[in-house]
Each structure stands twice: as structure tokens, then as C-alpha cells.
Interface confidence: low
Amino acid sequence: TEVKVIQPEKSVSVAAGDSTVLNCTLTSLLPVGPIRWYRGVGQSRQLIYSFTTEHFPRVTNVSDATKRSNLDFSIRISNVTPEDAGTYYCVKFQRGSPDTEIQSGGGTEVYVLAKPSPPEVSGPADRGIPDQKVNFTCKSHGFSPRNITLKWFKDGQELHPLETTVNPSGKNVSYNISSTVRVVLNSMDVNSKVICEVAHITLDRSPLRGIANLSNFIRVSPTVKVTQQSPTSMNQVNLTCRAERFYPEDLQLIWLENGNVSRNDTPKNLTKNTDGTYNYTSLFLVNSSAHREDVVFTCQVKHDQQPAITRNHTVLGF
């Protein structure tokens, strides 16, 4: 009966860096001739291993093929890389000049499992303000097989992406994923996180996460109020300028007297609120006896390179 070449596994999956065995058994020792392993078919097929004296780095025979009774022509490929993916054929030749191919196994497809890179989440270059819609993009690369799941979350709530693409669309040794999600910012988002979660067969149910802290992408402008306290003595008036619920910390506060700069504050001791925003209070003591006329005091707050917010307060002359 005609020799049969049997490759029992139709496919094997192996993690990048690991080794895999490709099994091949023959049903007969005859006719005499070499057995060779190829990746691919046709003119472009690549010789992977030949059971002769040639040396093939990373590929070794599993059993002693020199024994006359041996019918096992399995090979082990070590330190597998994504480039090793493909269909491998165990091929029997009949000795001659040249050798002629007489039978091939059905092929074993090698799927190389490569882990996705840790997801990287990028957001807008400029900070957004509450009620503004901003886009975040998550990217991960180098994974195989192509099947992958990507989910977005904000504070534990799943978000629906605008689009998710896996490239390339055709067969390849490894793949990349990119996904974009739109988030509507709100003033409570300073402590919020946007999380991109990637699940893949190689990750053993422990998805990879990329995190964007919304504190890096949001600007909450302060509410500014100027109030006059009850005078502590006949000659003194206390003015308070309060900047409330702002983020980030970058704040400059200037007191003006009838339009002229009177004092520059560079806040040091900011109060942090539970929602992550800050408050700052500046006290300004006015010597009322020095003012016969009404005086307009201005508190000017510059926050995070934004246009100044000004609040005026008139202190009546004595």
C-alpha cells in the first residue's frame, strides 16, 4: 500500500517565545527517501527542516530518525516568534536524481499567540472644560491571533466607542488595535479615570488596562467672590477674595486699587476639595482712614493661562 504521511493536529497554538512540536508519522518505511518539513505550499514554500545532516537553528527532530524502524518524523520548533506562523507540511520524497515528492501530510497550521502590548490611552492636547466633548484613543499592538476585545470604562461604567479597528484586515503575523471613545466632561471629573481594557486569548482572563486620569485633560474654572468682612477696628476693612472649585492648581491672584496693582498673590496653601478641585482665599486689609473717597478694589484671578476673571468691590470713603 502507498505510504501515508500523517500530521494528526490540524492546528496548534503556541505562545511567542515557547516551543511547539509538530507531529508527523509515516505508515511505511518504503520507498527509501528523505522527509522534509516545509512552511507553505508551491514555489514559495520554505524549507524548515530536513532529516539529513543539515543544521537548522531552532528546529530539532523529536525522535531518533536514524533508527531503521522509526516512523516518527515530528519536529520541535523552539523560541517561536510571530513570523513562524503558517501551515507546516511534512513531505515524503523518493530518493533519486533529483528526489521526487511522493506524499505530503495534510498540514498543521501554527498559530503563534502573541500578547498585546499594554494599552496606551491618549487624550486631547489641550484641557477641556465641563460639558465639552473630548476624544480618547487607546492603542495596543503586536498581538496574535487577531481576535481581541476592547472595552472602555469611565468610573466603572462601560462606554461605547466611536470606532474600533484592528489592522491589518487580512492575515498577518501580528495585529494592532485602535479605538476612540468620546467623553462628555463634567466638573466632578477631576478624580475620574477613563480606562481602556483589552482582553485576548494570551492574557488568561487578566485583561490589560490603560488608564487616562481626567485630571490631566480637564480644566474647571474658579468661581470668584469678593466680600467685605465687618471691620476689626475703625481704621481697617477686611476684604476677602475667594476662588472656589478650580482645577488645575495653577492660579495667580492680583489685588488692584482703582485699577492699579496693589498686591500680587502666588497661592501656596490651597485647600483641596473631596472632588479633587481646589479653593483659595486671599485676605486684603484696607486702611480705611487713608481713603476719603470711595475706592474700587478689584480681585483679578488668572487660572491656568486663561483670561482673567475680575470681581470688583467698592469701599466707601470715610
Epitope: 494528526p8 493536529e9 492546528s11 497554538s13
Partner: antibody
């Protein structure tokens, strides 16, 4: 025409080893081109592949049973056999042997033998 | 392991009806799928191999199609002798796994 026939005890005590043999008639087990398989079916349930052997050596087991299963072939008797150790009531099933062609499925089956695990 | 999900789990149809059973694999198995028929108290019988090839001696009213993850088994005109449970089985990845079965009855 190839035929398969399972044989072995119908009752096995818990913790003991279940041993079954499949005799091939009408063809040689060592003619090549086929795997010789064991499959079981729990009462009223679906089919579970246990493992398979090729006459010249390669053996494949279901990982869920691998620690307890041994499949062997005896070409001189044209038989292959199954041993399942440390059995429990959960191993009560109809056990089938079958011939599997490389690309033609399990085309020949034995009629099946019922094995009950009970003390 | 590859999970094979068969649906429906049971169906009732009239003689002459066209009956369709689907089988879904948990990942791509190319066309490495077989279909079997099992009558009560009997061993399974191979009907279709490699997803669409009719096994020797099987009537042409049985057919199979599909590739990748989704497969279909069809009986073009149900006959009384077709009362049985039908199973799909993948052989792309070890261990070979079967679907849960579809019990076909006559109305």
C-alpha cells in the same frame, strides 16, 4: 468491511481501574491512515472524546481525563485498549471505540458497552 | 477547549419538511467539522465530514455547509427513519469536542 467490538466488565467498583478492549476485524489496525479512538456517553447526555492512538505510537488524550487514562495498541492481536483509573460514579457511561480517518471523521464505531461504577 | 454550541436542542417537524440545525464553534475551526446521527440505543453514525462532504452510503437528503465558526446541517426532506439525535464534532484542536446534540422528532 472493518468492524469494531468493545469488551470488558460492565460493573466496576469506585476507585478501581476500568479496562476495555476494542477488537478490530475485517482490516489491519497497522495498515496506517487511521487513528483508533475511545469516546464515551454519560446516561442521557452528549458525547465526550477520551483519546486516540495511532498504531505506530502517537497517542492523544483529552486533558480533562489525561491523568487517569492510558490507551494502548496491540497490533499482534489487532486490538487497542482503554484503561481509566480511580473511577467514580461520574465515569458511569456507554463507552465506544471508533476508527477515525485523517480527513473522513469517525467512520466506523463499535456498538458500545455500558460500564457502571458502583460498589 | 473549543466549545461547540448546537441549536436548537430539540425540534419537531413533519415528514417532508426541511430541517436545519446549526453549530457554532467558540473559535475558527476552518472546515474541520463532522456531523453524526445517533438513534436510541445505537452508536453514532458519521453523516458528513469536513463540514460538507457526504460520508459513504449516506442519503443525499443530508447536507452540511459552513466554515470558520458557523456551520449548518440540513435534512432537505425529513423521513420517519431520520428520528435521532444529531451531533456536530470539531477536529481542528485537541481535544476533539462535540456539540450538545439536537433531538429530531416527527410531528
Amino acid at each position: 468491511q472493518v468492524q469494531l467490538q468493545e469488551s470488558g466488565p460492565g460493573l466496576v467498583k469506585p476507585s478501581q481501574t476500568l479496562s476495555l478492549t476494542c477488537t478490530v476485524s475485517g482490516g489491519s489496525i497497522s495498515s496506517g491512515g487511521y487513528y483508533w479512538s475511545w469516546i464515551r456517553q454519560h446516561p442521557g447526555k452528549g458525547l465526550e472524546w477520551i483519546g486516540a492512538i495511532y498504531y505506530s505510537g502517537p497517542i492523544y488524550y483529552n486533558p480533562s481525563l489525561k491523568s487517569r487514562v492510558t490507551i494502548s495498541v496491540d497490533t499482534s492481536k489487532n486490538q487497542f485498549s482503554l484503561k481509566l483509573s480511580s473511577v467514580t460514579a461520574a465515569d458511569t457511561a456507554v463507552y465506544y471505540c471508533a476508527r477515525e480517518g485523517y480527513h473522513s471523521g469517525m467512520d466506523v464505531w463499535g456498538q458500545g458497552t455500558t460500564v457502571t461504577v458502583s460498589s | 477547549d473549543i466549545q461547540m454550541t448546537q441549536s436548537p436542542s430539540s425540534l419537531s417537524a413533519s415528514v417532508g419538511d426541511r430541517v436545519t440545525i446549526t453549530c457554532q464553534a467558540s473559535q475558527d475551526i476552518s472546515n474541520y467539522l463532522n456531523w453524526y446521527q445517533q438513534k436510541p440505543g445505537k452508536a453514532p453514525k458519521l453523516l458528513i465530514y469536513d463540514a460538507s462532504n457526504l460520508a459513504t452510503g449516506v442519503p443525499s437528503r443530508f447536507s452540511g455547509s459552513g466554515s470558520g465558526t458557523d456551520f449548518t446541517f440540513t435534512i432537505s426532506s425529513l423521513q420517519p427513519e431520520d428520528i435521532a439525535t444529531y451531533y456536530c464534532q470539531q477536529f481542528a484542536y485537541l481535544p476533539w469536542t462535540f456539540g450538545g446534540g439536537t433531538k429530531v422528532e416527527i410531528k
